[in-house]
Interface confidence: medium
């Protein structure tokens, strides 16, 4: 048993039929010694008396909010949550496996630049009785500070008959140098509590591997005289690291017809302009990627040819 | 400051072209190692991230872009700072810092070159003949070192009489390639920055 936060404890249980469970001793937080009684979840049934209560925790029925009272007055609470281990593996019932980039990916993270700021998100099909808390650090043995905000519900989607909820959190490395070469990964730890079930999820990454620039901005077309060609120009996104001559991007320019089946013309360039042939009803899209370290491409920025 | 990206012009800044070749070569070599050594811990998640140049060179610090010298986090480990009176740089100071930066890059390349050559000698003794270092990568390191044009005494290749532990050598190769790729990225950024300046 360990303390998750004040008055909230996690009991780790091997989960199999007829498992013996864990013996837990609860102590009432009071100077009082006599006349103390214990109840569970505001039920009026008295479970025991005395300053300590010993319980055998085997299943969810044994978890919950234990309260000690004296003469009708509440003295203290202890909330017991269960963390299930089945066949040596901690349960992962609360979050959905995103299966990207590999199986058992519950947390996904992205950074728009090298400033040490990143966003992580996760999915669940649970809509109520759910709380998350997020901690992060650079390295684990001698951790350096990363500050994370509160996790918030960022999107709701309908997937077939199911509703899916996306939660996200923003974190910032306390002292990040954009030019630094990372040797220790960022560790992100998410505590998830659903009703009386506790689970924890972790992710480990280098900022350089989760970079995904914002799409290029100010995408413009300039027709070239007496030609079907146009000059496409764009700018680095505002959120990208500076100076741009050091943190350079490379770009992919795509001409796409109205029909998805039509052949796509693609040009790769390090410049912030390109000359392409603009077909009728086509659109021109540009996306960006770090020029020197191939992490993710940005989403497309698009303009119609007309 | 949003400087335009210039196309590689060997006359203007020959090192840029070589640094781009270097990054391409080390990335290809790393990819080859990952594929060939698929049953070895050779991915970024599996390896220990070691830097053989740690405490010997200070490329990141010496080559820090001017714009980042205002960032305290970037100055933590700097012995020399760009910032002089009111962060204005005299041209002599600029060229001195640039020389310091390029010599640090040269030292990096020299250290990696020695490590890779020593390692290749071991890998050539492997009866499985599973993997060798790409001669193109070694040649590109050499070309960039020559372009940097620093004269320093050649470091003798480390030789060992004992039978090498091939498993350990291959893991070390992965560690080295990952670290060298990260340094090659920094070198490429620096060359691009200097070229634009």
């Amino acid at each position: 048993i360990w303390e998750l936060k004040k008055d909230v404890y996690v009991v780790e249980l091997d989960w199999y039929p007829d498992a013996p469970g864990e013996m837990v001793v609860l102590t009432c937080d009071t100077p009082e010694e006599d006349g103390i009684t214990w109840t569970l979840d505001q039920s009026s049934e008295v479970l025991g008396s005395g300053k300590t209560l010993t319980i055998q925790v085997k299943e969810f029925g044994d978890a919950g909010q234990y309260t000690c009272h004296k003469g009708g007055e509440v003295l203290s609470h202890s909330l017991l949550l269960l963390h299930k281990k089945e066949d040596g593996i901690w349960s992962t019932d609360i979050l959905k496996d995103q299966k990207e980039p590999k199986n058992k990916t519950f947390l996904r993270c992205e950074a728009k630049n090298y400033s040490g700021r990143f966003t992580c998100w996760w999915l669940t099909t649970i809509s109520t009785d759910l709380t998350f808390s997020v901690k992060s650090s650079r390295g684990s043995s001698d951790p350096q500070g990363v500050t994370c905000g509160a996790a918030t519900l960022s999107a709701e989607r309908v997937r077939g008959d199911n509703k899916e909820y996306e939660y996200s959190v923003e974190c910032q490395e306390d002292s990040a140098c954009p030019a630094a070469e990372e040797s220790l990964p960022i560790e992100v730890m998410v505590d998830a509590v659903h009703k009386l079930k506790y689970e924890n999820y972790t992710s480990s990454f280098f900022i350089r591997d989760i970079i995904k620039p914002d799409p290029p901005k100010n995408l413009q077309l300039k027709p070239l005289k007496n030609s079907r060609q146009v000059e496409v120009s764009w700018e680095y996104p505002d959120t990208w690291s500076t100076p741009h001559s050091y943190f350079s991007l490379t770009f992919c320019v795509q001409v796409q017809g109205k029909s998805k089946r039509e052949k796509k013309d693609r040009v790769f360039t390090d410049k912030t302009s390109a000359t392409v042939i603009c077909r009728k009803n086509a659109s021109i899209s540009v996306r960006a990627q770090d020029r020197y370290y191939s992490s993710s491409w940005s989403e497309w920025a698009s303009v119609p040819c007309s | 400051r949003n400087l335009p990206v210039a196309t590689p012009d060997p006359g203007m800044f020959p090192c840029l072209h070589h640094s781009q070749n270097l990054l391409r070569a080390v990335s290809n070599m790393l990819q080859k190692a990952r594929q060939t050594l698929e049953f070895y811990p050779c991915t970024s998640e599996e390896i220990d991230h070691e830097d053989i140049t740690k405490d010997k060179t200070s490329t990141v610090e010496a080559c820090l872009p001017l714009e980042l010298t205002k960032n305290e986090s970037c100055l933590n480990s700097r012995e020399t700072s760009f910032i002089t009176n009111g962060s204005c740089l005299a041209s002599r100071k600029t060229s001195f810092m640039m020389a310091l930066c390029l010599s640090s890059i040269y030292e990096d390349l020299k250290m990696y070159q020695v490590e890779f050559k020593t390692m290749n000698a071991k890998l050539l003794m492997d009866p499985k003949r599973q993997i060798f270092l790409d001669q193109n990568m070694l040649a590109v390191i050499d070309e960039l070192m020559q372009a940097l044009n620093f004269n320093s005494e050649t470091v003798p290749q480390k030789s060992s009489l004992e039978e090498p532990d091939f498993y350990k050598t291959k893991i070390k190769l992965c560690i080295l390639l990952h670290a060298f790729r990260i340094r090659a990225v920094t070198i490429d950024r620096v060359m691009s920055y200097l070229n634009a300046s």
């Epitope: 979840d41 505001q42 039920s43 009026s44 299943e59 969810f60 029925g61 919950g64 909010q65 909330l79 019932d93 099909t125 649970i126 809509s127 109520t128 009785d129 008959d161 199911n162 509703k163 009703k195 009386l196 | -």
Partner: antibody, heavy 119, light 107 residues
């Protein structure tokens, strides 16, 4: 001892607004982990969950009725109030309030109040 | 929303019989299922929570099991006082939903 009691009009006219009050004792809505739900049951039919309010004022509604429902609490009076606008004869049912503890099941129910919607 | 399909709708049994009621969820609801008993003219009473946990004071002839989408409620030896309608309910996801009910009648 935990008890809940629903109160409100037995008869409402179509288009009118129904206001139901759940008065409870034996537990507090200022303490964490507690909440109160409203559920209804048309004559001879199944139960339908309507709305829920938690100790921290977090509210949930059945999406099919959300635009018509409002749930609120008065912690000092130990009361939870449900209002339902634009009543229709199909809303004729017995309305129950129930406590929902951390075990997330409705462990104590009121005796129910029957509401008939008719002109 | 999650649909809880409860079967059968009616059960006519004799005292001492074993009764099995099933509930199928339209999507996984983990173990967040409760079973209630509603005797004629009364409000529902909680029997089982978290799919298999017996609520305080509930006789051990009532048991529940299941996880994910398939849930079972069993009365091992029916008694005359068990005449009631039994409902399953999921509260894994809002809106919390109930099964259509199983009316148990004693011969």
């Amino acid at each position: 001892e935990v008890t809940l009691r629903e109160s409100g009009p037995a008869l409402v006219k179509p288009t009118q607004t129904l206001t139901l009050t759940c008065t409870f004792s034996g537990f507090s809505l200022s303490k964490s982990v507690m909440g109160v739900s409203w559920i209804r049951q048309p004559p001879g039919k199944a139960l339908e969950w309507l709305a829920h309010i938690y100790w921290d004022d977090d509210k949930y509604y059945n999406p099919s009725l959300k635009s018509r429902l409002t749930i609120s609490k008065d912690t000092s009076k130990n009361q939870v109030v449900l209002t339902m606008t634009n009543m229709d004869p199909v809303d004729t049912a017995t309305y129950y309030c129930a406590r929902r503890g951390i075990r997330s099941a409705m462990d104590y129910w009121g005796q129910g109040t029957t509401v008939t919607v008719s002109s | 929303s999650v649909v809880m399909t409860q079967t059968p709708k009616f059960l006519l049994v004799s005292a001492g019989d074993r009764v099995t009621i099933t509930c199928k969820a339209s999507q996984s609801v983990s173990n967040d299922v409760a079973w209630y008993q509603q005797k004629p003219g009364q409000s529902p009473k909680l029997l089982i929570y978290y799919a298999s946990n017996r609520y305080t004071g509930v006789p051990d002839r009532f048991t529940g099991s299941g996880y994910g989408t398939d849930f079972t409620f069993i009365i091992s030896t029916v008694r005359a006082e068990d005449l009631a309608v039994y409902f399953c309910q999921q509260d894994y996801n809002s809106p919390w939903t109930f099964g259509g009910g199983t009316k148990l009648e004693i011969k």
